[in-house]
Amino acid sequence: FGISGKHFITVTTFTSAGNIGEDGTLSCTFEPDIKLNGIVIQWLKEGIKGLVHEFKEGKDDLSQQHEMFRGRTAVFADQVVVGNASLRLKNVQLTDAGTYTCYIRTSKGKGNANLEYKTGAFSMPEINV
């Protein structure tokens, strides 16, 4: 879902799933501000104090990142200009499952959207004949 209206910007997320032990993506898009230095992207996880990831003023700010995500997150910095706020999550763990919030702030306003991230062994098993 997303929030829109005066002083709010529309943020869109998509429920997704991650394979344990592989890299996953939590998808989030928004209408990008041309002033990239004014864009703040924050990823939060329900039940976790601290941030999953923060990107502002054109670079990562991981000073408030929760330790369970340390070294495992990245945004697509070169894609922020086209409204891609998606989060890359490395080495997905079972405990990464849950409700995440993608929060965006620009010079025009702010908005957020939630997504449910499921984790598990979703890859098709190999069948040897």
Epitope: I9, E31, P32, D33, I34, K35, L36, N37, G38, E57, G58, K59, A77, D78, Q79, V81, V82, G83, T106, S107, K108
Partner: antibody, heavy 116, light 107 residues
Framework: EVQLLESGGGLVQPGGSLRLSCAAS????????MHWVRQAPGKGLEWVAS????????YYADSVKGRFTISRDNSKNTLYLQMNSLRAEDTAVYYC?????????WGQGTTVTVSS | DIQMTQSPSSLSASVGDRVTITCRAS??????LNWYQQKPGKAPKLLIY???IRESGVPSRFSGSGSGTDFTLTISSLQPEDFATYYC?????????FGQGTKLEIK
């Protein structure tokens, strides 16, 4: 083929008006921000104005603020630049460009000459 | 406003030479820098975006580097078709600003 095609340039007297158009084809126009950039004869590139994909963000260079208006019609895949109170220093080739990771697609340009 | 200063303004070189053009921003722009090539009478062409990522279809002899305030465009081995004017451009904030250009001429 991804393409931008400008039109609407010409000779105009100081104080006059022109409306430039930029017709987009070969890509989903409504998904991209757009820019106008100009180049005076023998000079470098100068950014003029930008508009985001849904027109939520619009910005102008100080040199054209209050005189030029950027707009878009996503249903027609067209970008516009309304230029009023034109001055001699507005004489230039005007390019529209797609806002991606860099201005990755440019039109061929349309020439605006402001002279009495 | 963020000023973009390119050096040199012009450069004479020969086919096969390695050439480096520098671009300096008046304040930090992270990695939000593009490089363009323009030939006379033609529209600019995007070469490098986000300081170091080569645009699709651009030959590998073109490379970009840098972050913060100092950036470089390198052409590893000049080809005849590379003689043109090169511009850097920041897209960190408005007004979007270009360098004054570097004209690369045949020696």
């Amino acid at each position: 083929e991804v393409q931008l095609l400008e039109s609407g340039g010409g000779l105009v007297q100081p104080g006059g008006s022109l409306r430039l158009s930029c017709a987009a084809s070969g890509f989903t126009f409504s998904s991209y921000g757009m820019h106008w950039v100009r180049q005076a004869p023998g000079k470098g590139l100068e950014w003029v104005a930008s508009i985001s994909s849904s027109s939520g963000y619009i910005y102008y260079a100080d040199s054209v603020k209050g005189r030029f208006t950027i707009s878009r019609d996503n249903s027609k895949n067209t970008l516009y630049l309304q230029m009023n109170s034109l001055r001699a220093e507005d004489t230039a080739v005007y390019y529209c460009a797609r806002a991606s990771s860099g201005m990755d697609v440019w039109g061929q340009g349309t020439t605006v000459t402001v002279s009495s | 406003d963020i000023q973009m200063t390119q050096s040199p303004s012009s450069l004479s070189a020969s086919v096969g030479d390695r050439v480096t053009i520098t671009c300096r921003a008046s304040q930090s722009i992270s990695s939000y820098l593009n490089w363009y090539q323009q030939k006379p009478g033609k529209a600019p062409k995007l070469l490098i975006y986000a300081a170091s990522i080569r645009e699709s279809g651009v030959p590998s002899r073109f490379s970009g580097s840098g972050s913060g305030t100092d950036f470089t465009l390198t052409i590893s081995s000049l080809q005849p078709e590379d003689f043109a004017t090169y511009y850097c451009q920041q897209y960190y904030t408005t007004p979007l600003t270009f360098g004054q250009g570097t004209k690369l001429e045949i020696k």
